[in-house]
Amino acid sequence: QDKPFLSAWPGTVVSEGQHVTLQCRSRLGFNEFSLSKEDGMPVPELYNRIFRNSFLMGPVTPAHAGTYRCCSSHPHSPTGWSAPSNPVVIMVTGVHRKPSLLAHPGPLVKSGETVILQCWSDVRFERFLLHREGITEDPLRLVGQLHDAGSQVNYSMGPMTPALAGTYRCFGSVTHLPYELSAPSDPLDIVVVGLYGKPSLSAQPGPTVQAGENVTLSCSSRSLFDIYHLSREAEAGELRLTAVLRVNGTFQANFPLGPVTHGGNYRCFGSFRALPHAWSDPSDPLPVSVTGNSRNL
């Protein structure tokens, strides 16, 4: 007996209050189906009901979290129904407050190296889920370590490749309610660096400026980079600008830093729009120093 295929659109991780579409596809082309939920709290809107093509479920509540299967209409079967489909686990987020997600030693990871993603919370979560944006497979399930101040998990990811780079979020859950998840952590962009040759970084009017003077950092390369990223040592985040083709055949971006008050070591990276989390080697560091200011960090 042909089993139908059950899928969830846009995915199986759904924010509380949002909608999710459950689609049941029969290889025999029958478009009527029934839905059942195997665990957790009952969902009355599924009972004694025949759906056509797909079902828009929502606004979802914690009660909707659980494992679903569908059976499609099957006129040649004794019961009139197919065998049950594959299971689809719907996880509902926003039930607990969000955990925090960090990368050690940092979110910029050299190609081939390993990064540790640490998800932690002051809530005692026995389970954590790690989810990468744009991936339809189930999130990675991790066992949390409980301690007096809450819980955490460390996940070692590597060797680093563009396939592992992306935007990550983590969620927490408790054992007795495994499909009711916390709100997502703030997103963390994991970037693989060292995939292309390094760009050049220079300063106009120069790397030593008076306090309050304007300085512009120019990042350039003969590679056809679409975007340049400028980062300052010991600072999270980066400035991002689109590259412009110059007359001399280089691709360049100018970062106006405005009136500077303190200096620091700057680096820039190049990347392509099609692979936003895959960057070049860093430029050589450019120390910018500010005179007439004691805070030359």
Epitope: E16, G17, Q23, S54, M57, G58
Partner: antibody, heavy 122, light 108 residues
Framework: QVQLQQSGAELVRPGTSVKVSCKAS????????IEWVKQRPGQGLEWIGV????????NDNEKFRGKATLTADTSSSTAYMQLTSLTSDDSAVYFC???????????????WGAGTTVTVSS | QIVLTQSPAIMSASLGARVTMTCTAS???????LHWYQQKPGSSPKLWIY???SLASGVPARFSGSGSGTSYSLTISSLEAEDAATYYC?????????FGGGTKLEIK
């Protein structure tokens, strides 16, 4: 600006069907739900059902099951509601509305069509 | 399903009066999941107040909304002639979404 333009009034015979259309403009059709609401003369508002144009997924009020079929054509940004086996109880104004999401659990209908009057009479 | 009961069904008040109408839910509605619509004869409903107390675009500041749990209200601080209409409360906290029976507001 954001608009939902509904098809014109219909006078139909009992037992027949009618298809009401709702053409969206001024926003990304796939990014919002389209809701359908019934209002009988001098009466209140009754939710019929909802369609997500992006996925084709639908949900409906048990009361209208087997009566209303909701579809959407993303190429023309148009939602449709077909009503079958019409009786005098189906004589009403039918509205489409955009289902919008705000904050944490806050769905409301922020833009409404002008309504389509369906009269069922022999 | 969540049943919304509006009271009074019909009310009349003088221009300049303070007017309050209520909406009671049969079970608790999540905070900020209750909305109000205004409808005038021959027209479609208009979103009037969303998420309990936020005024929709173009709605005069004399309107306000409040409430929590199962009890909600819409208040007009000083009634004007253009406020004559039927007002519906609405919840979409649980499927199916439901509307109250409406309060018809008339000018004395």
């Amino acid at each position: 600006q954001v608009q939902l333009q509904q098809s014109g009034a219909e006078l139909v015979r009992p037992g027949t069907s009618v298809k009401v259309s709702c053409k969206a403009s001024g926003y990304a059709f796939n990014n919002y739900l389209i809701e359908w609401v019934k209002q009988r003369p001098g009466q209140g508002l009754e939710w019929i059902g909802v369609i997500n144009p992006g996925s084709g997924g639908t949900n409906d009020n048990e009361k209208f099951r087997g009566k209303a079929t909701l579809t959407a054509d993303t190429s023309s940004s148009t939602a449709y509601m077909q009503l079958t086996s019409l009786t005098s109880d189906d004589s009403a104004v039918y509205f489409c509305a955009r289902g919008n999401y705000y904050g944490t659990r806050d769905w409301y209908f922020d833009v409404w069509g002008a309504g389509t009057t369906v009269t069922v009479s022999s | 399903q969540i049943v919304l009961t509006q009271s009074p069904a019909i009310m009349s008040a003088s221009l300049g009066a303070r007017v309050t109408m209520t909406c009671t839910a049969s079970s608790s509605v999540s905070s900020s999941s209750l909305h109000w619509y205004q409808q005038k004869p021959g027209s479609s409903p208009k979103l009037w107040i969303y998420s309990i107390s936020s005024l929709a675009s173009g709605v005069p500041a004399r309107f306000s909304g409040s409430g929590s749990g199962t009890s909600y209200s819409l208040t007009i601080s000083s009634l004007e002639a253009e406020d004559a209409a039927t007002y519906y409360c609405h919840q979409y906290h649980r499927s199916p979404p439901t509307f109250g029976g409406g309060t018809k507001l008339e000018i004395k």
